[in-house]
Amino acid sequence: MMCLECASAAAGGAEEEEADAERRRRRRGAQPGAGGSACCGARGVGGAGVVSADEEVQTLSGSVRRVPSGLPSIPSTPGCAAAAKGPSAPQPKPASLGRGRGAAAAILSLGNVLNYLDRYTVAGVLLDIQQHFGVKDRGAGLLQSVFICSFMVAAPIFGYLGDRFNRKVILSCGIFFWSAVTFSSSFIPQQYFWLLVLSRGLVGIGEASYSTIAPTIIGDLFTKNTRTLMLSVFYFAIPLGSGLGYITGSSVKQAAGDWHWALRVSPVLGMITGTLILILVPATKRGHADQLGGQLKARTSWLRDMKALIRNRSYVFSSLATSAVSFATGALGMWIPLYLHRAQVVQKTAETCNSPPCGAKDSLIFGAITCFTGFLGVVTGAGATRWCRLRTQRADPLVCAVGMLGSAIFICLIFVAAKTSIVGAYICIFVGETLLFSNWAITADILMYVVIPTRRATAVALQSFTSHLLGDAGSPYLIGFISDLIRQSTKDSPLWEFLSLGYALMLCPFVVVLGGMFFLATALFFLSDRAKAEQQVNQLVMPPASVKV
């Protein structure tokens, strides 16, 4: 237990260089007073008093132990914390450090909530925006398309910057930037819709900085299951922020008497959060939590990073699987409320809708379900993975694969149930989304396993780019297109409006199954890619000058 406390403290953010250096010295076991025993998870190596960095690599969801060639492995001593308490080894305060890192993770998660809150506030007041600017549905759709496109383009750029420059400064600047732009956009006159479109594009750039860099900071603040937990909290911010965005949009509009005020809430909170990030988030070093000794060598070129990522099969397959999740969530989020409304029209429990938004009630229910299943999915995914890790080293991708394949079944059942029972359809949505969302944090986990710390921001960015490009950037349009295509070849009736959209949405479970296959493929290469990443980390670590190797 003492060792665990010590490990968690030592893995903390490097607020001060001296404390950091001190911790490194302690990790190497080089102090005379340490009596040849090393603390915090690193095994002491007889006589020599040197602990090689490649003995234990802490990843998101557990430490991976390996025995260095020619050296015997000595288990960590339960009383190792006490051994470190010599005059030459001042003990860091675990509680305060832990609290500091916890606060940092909380602030980063809050920032993620605000990112999504801002994104979906616009969705919550979309009808007002259309009426204010007098634009068509496609004009309103342009707001989301421009956002996603700029987000996609900006993500790799911020990935590059995030692996090379001060991350918390980039984060804060990103938040300040999108907050200022969103706030300004609430004052755009009705004749200048193109300015609103431009502003959403700029917001996409600002938010890309956050989404690509924040997870990597969490990755450097925590290890083992704590990192899984913190990333779970971070990714739960997605459904929470999205749901709150809808609610904020409509409720602020009601309370303030005008929809423009809805666009002024998240910027104010954003400015506060950006400031808190600057103050409370430590300037962690890349790979800080993964390193047990030494300093990371100079960074590689962006081109070399990209080549390495493209050759990393686990990364490529898990990114393709993430795209499948994105495809399904994008399409279902857009069309399920309307589909359920049409189902009710067929069942004669609702009137034919002549004035959208059709299925406004269904949108609210669906939003609430998404919010809750997001939380439930992240928690069950992390829990299932933790349990399965005791049985197999391939737990992460396998849990994701099972979740995806199970989700596909329940998504299929939505269309069966909707014909006769809306409640049944909602139950299928609930289970299907829970399973679908169960892989959010685990996918980030897989990335942290198979990608070296100095490439993580680039990896997150590229994964984000791919999942939007192949996923939610096109899926809502594609489903609408297929639905229209089916309707053109059938007679004009409420039944066929319902069926055509249902048949089009059937593409989602197929894509989800494909995503499950990609996760199974990830499982095939996972162990070898993880070993490669660990080996690369060791090669990247400069041995301490005072130690001969």
């Epitope: 009808l127 007002d128 204010h132 007098g134 068509k136 006159p189 009705q190 509009k253 005008d258 406004a360």
Partner: antibody, heavy 115, light 110 residues
């Protein structure tokens, strides 16, 4: 079913004031921008004023700016048009309208400005 | 701000097809929705087409709306014209929250 019912029209002298009301039913009133449209005898339709969902933003045609005030009461599902400093050219049938999505019109109320 | 121009009057024969046009003076006709209203003498307007091409319930499928990008116009097509179609037809579009109306076309059925 959507219903818009105007009231408050009649004969008024130039320079005087008049207030028109429009009671809405059959749809979520506070989701929609609303407008007043008028039609002078033997003339076409002419937009007069419109108001945002919460009433915070109002728009007027140049000829009525500063004289007419559009407002709404979302709790009572009612739209208003306060007309001050009326002129003879304001004589028309005034329609309350929801012009977004599927537009709906009231039956209209006649306002005659004459001495 | 743009202007919507409609022909003052159009005459057509009973049972034939007629196209009523509504030309936008500046900006793309496709940028904003176009609605079409019919008004019989002494009555309030009723919506015949909204959102460019959508028919409300109760409007016969003889009526259809379309956008002609080449002439930057919206078109209201009435097939198999009937005596009750004789009325004024107004087109309307949006410039932000300002509603722009065409001058109206008087359709006469011969």
């Amino acid at each position: 079913e959507v219903h818009l019912v105007e009231s408050g029209g009649g004969l008024v002298q130039p320079g005087r004031s008049m207030k028109l009301s429009c009671t809405a039913s059959g749809f979520t009133f506070n989701n929609y921008y609303m407008a007043w449209v008028r039609q002078a005898p033997t003339k076409g339709l002419e937009w007069v004023a419109s108001i945002s969902t919460g009433g915070g933003y109002t728009y007027y045609r140049d000829s009525v700016k500063g004289r007419f005030t559009i407002s709404r009461d979302n709790t009572g599902n009612t739209l208003y048009l306060q007309m001050d400093s009326l002129r003879s050219e304001d004589t028309a049938t005034y329609y309350c309208a929801r012009c977004w999505e599927l537009p709906y019109w009231g039956q209209g109320v006649m306002v005659t400005v004459s001495s | 701000q743009f202007v919507l121009t409609q022909p003052n009057s159009v005459s057509t024969n009973l049972g034939s097809t007629v196209k009523l046009s509504c030309r936008r003076s500046s900006g793309n006709i496709g940028n904003n929705y176009v609605n079409w209203y019919r008004q019989h003498e002494g009555r309030s307007p009723t919506t015949m087409i909204y959102r460019d091409d959508t028919r409300p319930d109760g409007v016969p499928n003889r009526f259809s709306g379309s956008i002609d990008r080449s002439s930057n116009s919206a078109l209201l097509t009435i097939n198999n014209v009937r005596p009750e179609d004789e009325a004024y037809y107004f087109c309307q579009s949006y410039s932000g929250s300002i509603y722009i109306f065409g001058g109206g076309t008087k359709l006469t059925v011969l």
